[in-house]
């Protein structure tokens, strides 16, 4: 029989979006065992008919990668999941609507920072999705987002950064002391998404002047 | 070398359609931001639209949402502006501008359109 | 959308004068600020971006400063060939909109 509370066998299922790779996740819930069995449907909101999801149909694991079956930008996705205990009582909870536009949070950003006798030179490299273009190029942030920029940062000691922004990928701090070590912080900012992801850091050495030796 | 040409502009009737092209060369067509603005006769510059050539996304300015599609076709470097129930305030020199390493700084000479009955 | 009030939508200067031209967003913007010429007939041609960073290419007679909402553009010593129209551009966020524009003449 059904529980007088789906609670008691499963909790929390929602999304979990990081880079639009769309993870749905569950917990068990007081009553749920390690042989508890779950099964994950989706749908494109809209639609009326739920999609069993290959590969997440009476699982263990809480939690399943929805990443290609809500794919497409544009569109809203709802996913649910079904527990069924050993004793054979069922729940089904499903989750909030979803937007990967809107919920996605973002990763660092892959930066490669390059120490000079003067300057630090930051190269931003494009984040790549898992959302694949009709060429079979795997988008970037970039192609997703018009308004996406970079922040960086250069710690000068502890009470002067330096401070550069911009959509280039490429950055150069000069001006700095020969021989002295600096903390370089670069963030991915999506103002009209109110996005920002957590810092990518690197410590780096400008080279010894060598000109006087 | 950067070159943007457009063409297909022309005089039309209020609540008529045109549609724009811009063919572009001399940079990496298919994953970059494309642009379409505008000029009015005397007047400031309008960003009118925007598409990313490789994901699709596409934004609009108010004033045309619903009238305006941006598109392109990769195979050719061509960017499209279709153009549908034209008013008079649609009037202006419209260009195709790019976004390269970060910056927008490369435009068409323009192609003029006319909404006038 | 980000509203760009520029000023003065003219100016009559001398060869020679230092002429400032100011641009105020209805939001803050950070640095996400550029200053574009345009002569009559012509492309608008990119002088400024990041509020301050001169394009390749272009005299060190113009400079750009500001942050947050206000932003000028200077030129320390008008020449004949900078008389046209200037315009100041915020690349934060869509829509990006343009000031209405400022033009050089000759007095």
């Known amino acids: 029989h059904a529980p007088e509370d789906p609670s008691d066998l499963l909790q929390h299922v929602k999304f979990q979006s990081s880079n639009f790779e769309n993870i749905l996740t569950w917990d068990s819930g007081p009553e749920g065992t390690p042989d508890t069995v779950y099964s994950i449907e989706y749908k494109t909101y809209g639609e009326r008919d739920w999609v069993a999801k290959k590969g997440c149909q009476r699982i263990t694991r809480k939690s399943c990668n929805l990443t290609v079956e809500t794919g497409n930008l544009t569109e809203l996705y709802y996913a649910r999941v079904t527990a069924v205990s050993a004793g054979g009582r069922s729940a089904t909870k499903m989750t909030d609507r979803f937007s990967s536009l809107q919920h996605t949070t973002l990763k660092p950003p892959d930066v490669t920072c390059i120490s000079k006798v003067r300057s630090i030179q930051m190269i931003v490299h494009p984040t790549p999705t898992p959302i694949r273009a009709g060429d079979g190029h795997r988008l970037t942030l970039e192609d997703i987002f018009h308004d996406l920029f970079y922040h960086l940062e250069l710690q000068v000691n502890r009470t002067y950064q330096m401070h550069l922004g911009g959509k280039q990928r490429e950055y150069e701090f000069f001006g700095l002391t020969p021989d002295t070590e600096f903390l370089g912080t670069i963030m991915i900012c999506v103002p009209t998404w109110a996005k920002e992801s957590a810092p990518y850091m690197c410590r780096v050495k400008t080279l010894p002047d060598r000109t006087w030796t | 070398e950067v070159q943007l040409v457009e063409s297909g502009g022309g005089l039309v009737q209020p609540g008529g359609s045109l549609r724009l092209s811009c063919a572009a060369s001399g940079f990496t067509f298919s994953s970059s931001w494309m642009y379409w603005v505008r000029q009015a006769p005397g007047k400031g510059l309008e960003f009118v639209s925007v598409i990313n050539t490789r994901s699709g996304i596409t934004h609009y300015v108010e004033s045309v949402k619903g009238r305006f599609t941006i598109s392109t076709d990769n195979a050719k470097n061509t960017l499209f502006l279709q153009m549908n129930s034209l008013k008079s305030e649609d009037t202006a020199v419209y260009y195709c501008a790019t976004r390269i390493q970060g910056l927008i700084d490369y435009w068409g000479q323009g192609t003029q359109v006319t909404v006038s009955s | 959308d980000i509203v760009m009030t520029q000023s003065p939508s003219s100016l009559s200067a001398s060869l020679g004068d230092r002429v400032t031209i100011t641009c105020q967003a209805t939001q803050s913007i950070s640095t996400f600020l550029s200053w574009y010429q345009q002569k009559p007939g012509q492309t608008p041609k990119l002088l400024v971006y990041g509020a301050s960073r001169l394009q390749t290419g272009v005299p060190s007679r113009f400079s750009g400063t500001g942050s947050g909402t206000k932003f000028t553009l200077t030129i320390s010593g008008v020449e004949a060939e900078d008389l046209a129209s200037y315009f100041c551009?915020?690349?934060?966020?869509?829509?990006?909109?343009f000031g209405q524009g400022t033009k050089v003449e000759l007095k």
């Open positions: 551009l915020q690349d934060y966020s869509w829509p990006l909109t």
